[in-house]
């Protein structure tokens, strides 16, 4: 996170009269994972299975369409970011199982968690880009007809990835491997040591650019889209409302704990009780944020087609139907069919 990222098992009271045999645990609790860590492992496992399968299917479907369809470009990039994030999960999983011991070395400590951050921020920023695109389609249809092309879409994606990279650089630069003397353990985390101000600056920038700004973009865009959609009686849809709420709420809910604890930890002394408590919850907050990486395919399926009459079909068949339908896949994560539908017929083949 924003401060040194680790927790340790409770080794209990070490009595001078007892032998400290490092070949065995110091006490029985040392082999027991904390409840937040167990919950994090469960979430990681579910996110990995759903995220890899779901996003792989999205990538497979959208890859064929990406050359000619703008919405396919959005979903391809989004799915790639989520998919790559999910691939890194076994490493986090292994580290938590080993009480946050990091057996992967210094280079892996710098690169792997930074890649995870890169992909997660890319997902957020791409989601904000998609929202902006939805907004333009509804409110600037003529502009879209003239300028909304695949080239511009790829540039927008490149900007999103670039900004994600910028957000990740501090984490990469300050990431170190620390070997604790007792209990013997190698830890991987961010160590700002002498530069608390820089740590706070990184946390604030991350909060604003990686959370508040995309959240604001999503909320404003979808509020205006909803108002426009609902102002047209013929296109009024409770499904649209549900999807918009699902998109914004899931983004907000799953990222909130990570961002709040991150900003709090950057302002707290590492030895303070509050910091230590938040540090124990760190893995759970990260795993909670990771739910964003598998939620998209779920929203595509649930919101895109609804449950009725679809549960009888197999999952691959269901996903194929959802992801290949123009009115669903090519409409945005919000699946607004309203005023966009008529525009879509003119612009989707760009």
């Amino acid at each position: 996170m924003n401060s040194f990222n680790y927790t340790t098992p409770d080794y209990g009271h070490y009595d001078d009269k007892d032998t400290l045999d490092l070949n065995t645990p110091v006490d029985k609790t040392s082999n027991t994972l904390r409840v937040p860590d167990i919950l994090a492992l469960v979430i990681f496992a579910v996110v990995f299975l759903v995220g890899v399968l779901g996003n792989a299917l999205v990538v497979w479907v959208t890859a064929f369409e990406a050359k000619r369809t703008i919405n396919a470009i959005w979903f391809l990039n989004l799915a790639v970011a989520d998919f790559l994030s999910c691939l890194a999960l076994p490493i986090l999983f292994t580290s938590i199982v080993q009480h946050h011991h990091w057996p992967f070395g210094g280079a892996a400590c710098s690169i792997l968690p930074s890649l995870i951050l890169l992909n997660m921020y890319a997902s957020i920023l791409l989601l904000a880009t998609i929202s902006a695109d939805r907004f333009l389609l509804v409110f600037k249809p003529i502009w879209c007809q003239n300028f909304r092309g695949a080239g511009l879409a790829w540039i927008a994606c490149a900007v999103a990835w670039g900004l994600a990279l910028l957000l990740t650089i501090p984490s990469f630069l300050y990431r170190v491997v620390r070997e604790e003397y007792f209990p013997p353990k190698v830890l991987c985390g961010v160590d700002y040591s002498h530069d608390k101000r820089r740590e706070r600056a990184v946390a604030i920038v991350r909060l604003v650019l990686g959370f508040l700004w995309p959240l604001l973009t999503l909320t404003i865009c979808y509020t205006f889209i909803l108002l426009r959609t609902w102002s047209r009686r013929a296109t009024r849809s409770t499904k649209t409302l549900k999807v918009v709420v699902a998109v914004v709420a899931s983004f907000f809910i799953f990222w909130l704990p990570y961002q709040v604890t991150g900003i709090m930890m950057s302002f707290l002394e590492p030895s303070s009780p509050t910091f230590l408590l938040l540090n124990k919850l760190d893995s759970l907050c990260v795993s909670f944020a990771y739910i964003n990486c598998c939620i998209n395919p779920i929203i595509y399926v649930v919101a895109g087609q609804g449950f009725q009459g679809r549960l009888r079909k197999s999952l691959p068949s269901l996903l194929r139907n959802v992801l290949t339908e123009e009115s669903v896949v090519r409409e945005s994560k919000s699946f607004t069919r309203s005023t966009v539908d008529t525009m879509a017929q003119k612009t989707q083949a760009v």
Epitope: F4, D21, E179, Y181, P270
Partner: antibody
Framework: QVQLQQSGAELAKPGASVKLSCKAS????????IHWVKQRPGQGLEWIGY????????KYNQKFKDKATLTADKSSSTAFMQLSSLTYEDSAVYYC??????????????WGQGTTLTVSS | DVVMTQTPLSLPVSLGDQASISCRSS???????????LQWYLQKPGQSPKLLIY???NRFSGVPDRFSGSGSGTEFTLKIRRVEAEDLGVFLC?????????FGAGTKLELK
């Protein structure tokens, strides 16, 4: 009372090996780790490594991994440090130290008197 | 490795003065359990070091209360309220949070 009695001064030639000893008394030898520390004349202290006398578990400073070998003999309550392939830079005072602490072996509470090693041709 | 930087290297004092020695670490010494394992030792000429302060601010048994330690993270200070003749020697800071364990170069407390 707790005591760590180290062997006397050593004079060795470059390339040779030497084995320093540290006899513990006044406490249960196998219950406390023994660390070894190097101090060159007019310089600071350098941590070499430690041994857990009960399980013969050792941990070394990477800098001394190929230089020092730590062993312990529970029957005589003695810890040993062998220094190999001696060079002039190995000339120093070597301390054995016992560690303690309420929640782990974090503090050096009892020190030996030190063994002076001189490497000279 | 964690570099422990002590200042000053030499501190001339008069008996009864207050003395202050600083120790800075290149990395945070906060352990994952929340404790900071920073110790202070005093080494008198021709003797082995003796433990004065452990865990930043805790006096070891038998250490007079004129010795006090403070600090957090990477910045630490040892204060001697009224210097006595038996206090003269080299003061060393040391960390046992991270491997390898490291020591400062020492601060020589001497009479003016």
């Amino acid at each position: 009372q707790v005591q760590l009695q180290q062997s006397g001064a050593e004079l060795a030639k470059p390339g040779a090996s030497v084995k320093l000893s540290c006899k513990a008394s006044g406490y249960t030898f196998s219950s406390y780790w023994i660390h070894w520390v190097k101090q060159r004349p007019g310089q600071g202290l350098e941590w070499i490594g430690y041994i857990n006398p009960r399980g013969d578990y050792t941990k070394y400073n990477q800098k001394f991994k190929d230089k020092a070998t730590l062993t312990a003999d529970k029957s005589s309550s003695t810890a040993f440090m062998q220094l190999s392939s001696l060079t002039y830079e190995d000339s120093a005072v070597y301390y054995c130290v016992r560690v303690t602490g309420s929640e782990g072996p974090y503090y050096f509470d009892y020190w030996g008197q030190g063994t002076t090693l001189t490497v000279s041709s | 490795d964690v570099v422990m930087t002590q200042t000053p290297l030499s501190l001339p004092v008069s008996l009864g003065d207050q003395a202050s020695i600083s120790c800075r670490s290149s990395q945070s010494l906060v352990h994952s359990n929340g404790n900071t394992y920073l110790q202070w030792y005093l080494q008198k000429p021709g003797q082995s070091p003796k433990l004065l302060i452990y865990k930043v601010s805790n006096r070891f048994s038998g250490v007079p209360d004129r010795f006090s330690g403070s600090g957090s993270g990477t910045e630490f200070t040892l204060k001697i309220r009224r210097v006595e003749a038996e206090d003269l020697g080299v003061f060393l800071c040391s960390q046992s949070t991270l491997v390898p364990l490291t020591f400062g170069a020492g601060t020589k407390l001497e009479l003016k």
